[in-house]
Interface confidence: low
């Protein structure tokens, strides 16, 4: 049973964290069913669609305004109690974001990282923000709070993720907090995707017509591996984006994918990583590096036709 | 350089109140949370609560909720720690510390303390 | 509220010894943890911080090390002035508890 033995068990679907104008649903789980039940919040700004009402199963709250944030509990139908209800339910904090200025998110010493690595988020703004929030997406539990630090004019907090394993690889966002008002929530910082590398085989990586090409002739870098890898990501040393192409099967059994980087015009160090669809932010061991060499004359940049992906977006499906 | 300073020690009768100061030199007191550590004889350390001089916000260990006040003064750089209805087991040292910045900041730097002592 | 266990309490050593000592926190604090000396009658110095990082000023023989839940401070060779009481933190959420102490004291 998720509560005690008199107690239900109060829940919110998707998230605790909800957007200003946004829904939730709350579920009172009790009995190991859902029953009638009655909702209440624990401070003085009460919600006053709540009073009296009986709600069954669950309850969609909303649009949620900066007043729903706080602290609520449930009680349980309980017809033969004395007083007809359970025990109240455990507290579930319900945080209203959009209220503030988005802060930022930085990783240190960047978003890609080794599996056993650590990472620190460190989450900053020119709002004096008291606390700061981070949030993992598609995890419904409450996000880590740390208390902001003030210094030269901006707060900010760093929090450390690992050792990292698979699941702790997805997309943050964090949130801030003013004094006084610690569940009205700052709106949320752009979404930071952190990749864990090092999980699976590495693939290798070759160049068309070969590692060392003329200024301006066409460049292909092929991605490969017999692993069923869904998704190929290929990185330049030096550059903060990434390219990700689907992989293809080939008739020798591995999987492949293509990049054209147009015709040359400078040389780099290239390397890749396969992913799989389930799992899109956690990649595989890089590929042996590539130098890519350009004979003749040097530009400052190679043209992509390969759309490079933006700072976020690397755990979403391709579709 | 950094300095946390702090008054001299107080002898209460119980049920009396003391007033326990921290005066910071050396960096902008608004820029830093300041907090407060208690030791009683013998015994290991204790976070009592901080307060943020910016904002005025404070935070405490729920041990210590009705036992203390945090203030500050911006004007004079100065913390303040207020215990309430002493008992004889407020006896202890109290130190008042500054939460530094960077990653995943400690205190960096003390107060020397001031003894509390409680006695009929 | 985090617990913070720190072992042993009391610990008997020799100069040039190598030391260990250790802080289990009741959940993952991440790394944020810092190591604090303190000697009688004056108040704690800051000794180590974010787990591994050793403050300005202190020597090389101190070292930190750990993650998750368990950490370590590590002597490499006691000299006179180290006998003192050492105290773990943990900074990850309040109440910022700290660990009982450890008493290290010459053989």
């Known amino acids: 049973l998720m509560g005690g033995q008199d107690k239900p068990f109060l829940s919110a679907r998707p998230s605790t964290v909800v957007p200003r104008g946004g829904h939730v649903a709350l579920q009172c789980h009790y009995r190991r069913g859902f029953n009638n039940f009655m909702l209440y919040k624990e401070d003085r700004s009460h919600v006053p669609i709540f009073h009296g009402r009986i709600f069954q199963e669950s309850f969609i709250m909303g649009p949620v305004t900066p007043a729903h944030a706080g602290t609520y509990r449930c009680r349980g139908s309980r017809p033969h109690s004395l007083t007809g209800w359970s025990a109240p339910s455990n507290p579930l904090v319900i945080m209203v974001t959009g209220n503030h200025r988005k802060p930022s998110l930085l990783a240190h010493p960047g978003p890609l990282l080794k599996s056993g690595e650590t990472v620190i988020l460190q989450c900053w703004s020119d709002v004096m923000f008291e606390h700061f929030f981070l949030h993992r997406e598609g995890i419904s539990e409450d996000p880590s709070r740390l208390v902001g630090q003030i210094h030269d004019g901006v707060s900010k907090a760093n929090f450390s993720i690992g050792p990292l394993m698979p699941v702790l690889a997805g997309t943050y966002r964090c949130y801030g907090s003013v004094p006084h008002s610690p569940y009205q929530l700052s709106a949320p910082s752009d979404p930071l995707d952190i990749v864990i590398t090092g999980l699976y085989e590495k693939p290798s990586l070759s160049a068309q017509p070969g590692p060392t090409v003329q200024a301006g002739e066409n460049v292909t870098l092929s991605c490969s591996s017999w692993s069923s890898y869904d998704i190929y990501h290929l990185s330049r040393e030096g550059e903060a984006h990434e390219r990700r192409l689907r992989a293809v099967p080939k008739v020798n059994r591995t999987f492949q994918a293509d990049f054209p980087l147009g015709p040359a015009t400078h040389g780099g160090t290239y390397r890749c990583f396969g992913s799989f669809r389930a799992l899109p932010c956690v990649w595989s061991n890089s590929s042996d590096p590539l130098l890519v060499s350009v004979t003749g004359n040097p530009s400052s940049s190679w043209p992509s036709p390969t759309e490079p992906s933006s700072k976020s977006g690397i755990c979403r499906h391709l579709h | 350089q950094v300095q946390l300073v702090q008054s001299g020690a107080e002898l209460a009768r119980p049920g009396a109140s003391v007033k326990v100061s921290c005066k910071a030199s050396g960096y902008t007191f608004t820029s830093y949370t300041m907090h407060w550590v208690r030791q009683a004889p013998g015994q290991g350390l204790e976070w009592i609560g901080y307060?943020?001089?910016?904002?005025?916000?404070?935070e405490n260990n729920r041990k210590f909720k009705d036992k203390t006040t945090l203030t500050a003064d911006k004007s004079t750089s100065t913390a303040y720690m207020e215990l309430s209805s002493l008992r004889s087991e407020d006896t202890a040292v109290y130190y008042c510390a500054r939460l530094g910045k960077g990653l995943l900041p400690p205190f960096d730097y003390w107060g020397q303390g001031t003894t509390v002592t409680v006695s009929s | 509220d985090i617990q913070m266990t720190q072992s042993p309490s009391s610990l008997s050593a020799s100069v040039g010894d190598r030391v260990t000592i250790t802080c289990r926190a009741s959940e993952n604090i991440y790394s944020n943890l810092a190591w604090y000396q303190q000697k009688p009658g004056k108040a704690p110095q800051l000794l180590v911080y974010?787990?591994?990082n050793l403050a300005d000023g202190v020597p090389s023989r101190f070292s930190g090390s750990g993650s998750g839940t368990d950490y370590t401070l590590t002597i490499s060779s006691l000299q006179p002035e180290d006998f003192a009481t050492y105290y773990c933190q943990h900074f990850w959420g309040t109440p910022y508890t700290f660990g009982g102490g450890t008493k290290l004291e010459i053989k």
């Open positions: 974010a787990a591994t």
């Open positions: 307060i943020n001089p910016s904002s005025g916000y404070t």
